[in-house]
Amino acid sequence: FPQDRPFEDTCRGNPGHYYDKAVRRCCYRCPTGLFPTQQCPQRPADCRKQCEPDYYLDEAGRCTACVSCSRDDLVEKMPCAWNSSRVCECQPGMFCAVSVVNSCARCFFHSVCPAGMIVKFPGTAQKNTVCEPASPGVSPACASPENCKEPSSGTIPQAKPTPVSPATSNASTMPLRGGTRLAQEAASKLTRAPGSPSSVGRPSSDPGLSPTQPCPQGSGDCRKQCEPDYYLDEAGRCTACVSCSRDDLVEKTPCAWNSSRICECRPGMICATSATNSCARCVPYPICAAETGTKPQDMAEKDTTFEAPPVGTQPDCSPTPENGEAPASTSPTLSSLVDSQASKTLPIPTSAPIALSSTGK
C-alpha cells in the first residue's frame, strides 16, 4: 500500500523497531533473549523470556520445568502453558495422600466404607471417601442392627486407605477401621521435575516424613527423609534432583540427601544456557573463543546467549578448510540450536540470534 510507505520507512529507520507488513504497523523489536507477548509489540513490557516446550515462565521470570503426569496413577488436569505449570491429579478412583506443587506424590485408592457405614462424602482426587454410621431404617447398607449402632466414642469412624500401588488395588477393599485420613497439610511439599522416576508414587516410606521409630539417642537418622531422587533443600523442603538423562549431559555430582545432582555438558560440549545445577543448552565446543559472541568460560557460568559469528567470517585461530568454508558444526543453521525443541526434556532456549548462512554451513 503506497500510503504506508512513509510510515514504513520511518519505522525501518529506527533500529529498535520493525515494520510488520502483515499488520501494517510499526512494532517494537524485543531485545535478544526476550520474546514478544503479542503479534506487534509496542513497548518493552510486551516482551518476555521464552521457555522451551514443557517449561513455563514462573513469577520470578525463570523458565521452570512443568511437572510430569507420566506416572500411572496421575492424569493431567491442566496443560503446561507458557506461564503456568502442568497440573496433575490422581486418576479417577484415587485420592492424593501426599500433595506436591502442581501434582501428587502419593495417590491411594478411595476406601470402601465397611459394613455398617455409608458414604457421607464420595472420594475426590484430593480427598478420600468419608464414611458415617448408617442410621437404622435409613440405609439398606446396614446388614444387621449391630452394624448400625452409633459408635460409643461419639466420633465418626473414617476409612483409612491402605497404602497400595495400583497393581494391588484389591487391597483397598480392606480399609482399616477407626483411623483418620492422611492429612495433606502434614505432607511435605515436593517439587517434581520431568524425568524423576516413576517410583516416586510408590515409596516404602512417606516422603518428607521422619522415620516412624523414635530417634535413638545420638542417632543421626532423625533428619527429614525425602523420596529417592529428591533432596532436602535449605528451606527444609524435599525438592527433585535435576535429571542428567539428556544425551548431552553427564552427572558431575550425584543426588544426595541434602544436595541435588549436578549435571554438566558431556566432553566436547560447552554450556550455552546454564540452569540451576545443570545446563539447559549444550552446544558443540567451538574451534576457538573468537568464533562465538561469548567466551566459553562465560557460557559455563551464567545464563548467556550463544551468538554465531557474522556470516562469512572465519576465525584466525584454526586452520581454514581448503574450500574456505567453516565446518558445519561451528556456525549454527536455521535450527541447529533449536532442533531439540520437540524433545520434552530440554529446558530453556537460548533465544539468541543464530547465523543463517546462504552456504548452509
Partner: nanobody, 123 residues
C-alpha cells in the same frame, strides 16, 4: 542483517503445482518462524502458511489446507511452499516473512520480509 530471497514463482494452469523457496541469510532469532503471505491486486494481504523452525510445527490458512505444504531444509536455511491443485484465486504476489514466535501463541512477529515472487494461475 537478515535477508530473505524468494524464488519459484511463475505461471501455471489451474490444477498445476509450483514450489516456492525462501532462502534466509544473515541473522535470525533462534526460536523463530518463517512463513508465507500473499497479496492479490486490490486485495488485503493474506497469511498463507507458517513453520516454526525449531519444533517443525506447521500452520496453514483454511484456504490452502490440504493443498499447500510448508517445509524446511535446515542445511540450506531455506523454507519451501509446495503448492498443489492450484486455483485461479491463488494468483498473487507471494511474500516470505521471518521473525520470532510470539510467546504462548502460534503467530510470528514477521520482522523480516523478502521482495516477493509472483504466482499466476490461469484457468
Amino acid at each position: 542483517q537478515v535477508k530473505l530471497v524468494e524464488s519459484g514463482g511463475g505461471s501455471v494452469q489451474a490444477g498445476g503445482s509450483l514450489r516456492l523457496s525462501c532462502a534466509a541469510s544473515g541473522y535470525i532469532y533462534s526460536s523463530n518462524c518463517m512463513g508465507w503471505f500473499r497479496q492479490a491486486p486490490g486485495k488485503e494481504r493474506e497469511w498463507v502458511a507458517r513453520i516454526h523452525t525449531g519444533s517443525g510445527s506447521t500452520y496453514y490458512a483454511d484456504s490452502v489446507k490440504g493443498r499447500f505444504t510448508i517445509s524446511q531444509d535446515n542445511a540450506k536455511n531455506t523454507v519451501y511452499l509446495q503448492m498443489n491443485s492450484l486455483r485461479p484465486e491463488d494468483t498473487a504476489m507471494y511474500d516470505c516473512a521471518a521473525g520470532r514466535v510470539v510467546l504462548g501463541a502460534v503467530v510470528c512477529t514477521n520482522e523480516y520480509w523478502g521482495q516477493g515472487t509472483q504466482v499466476t494461475v490461469s484457468s
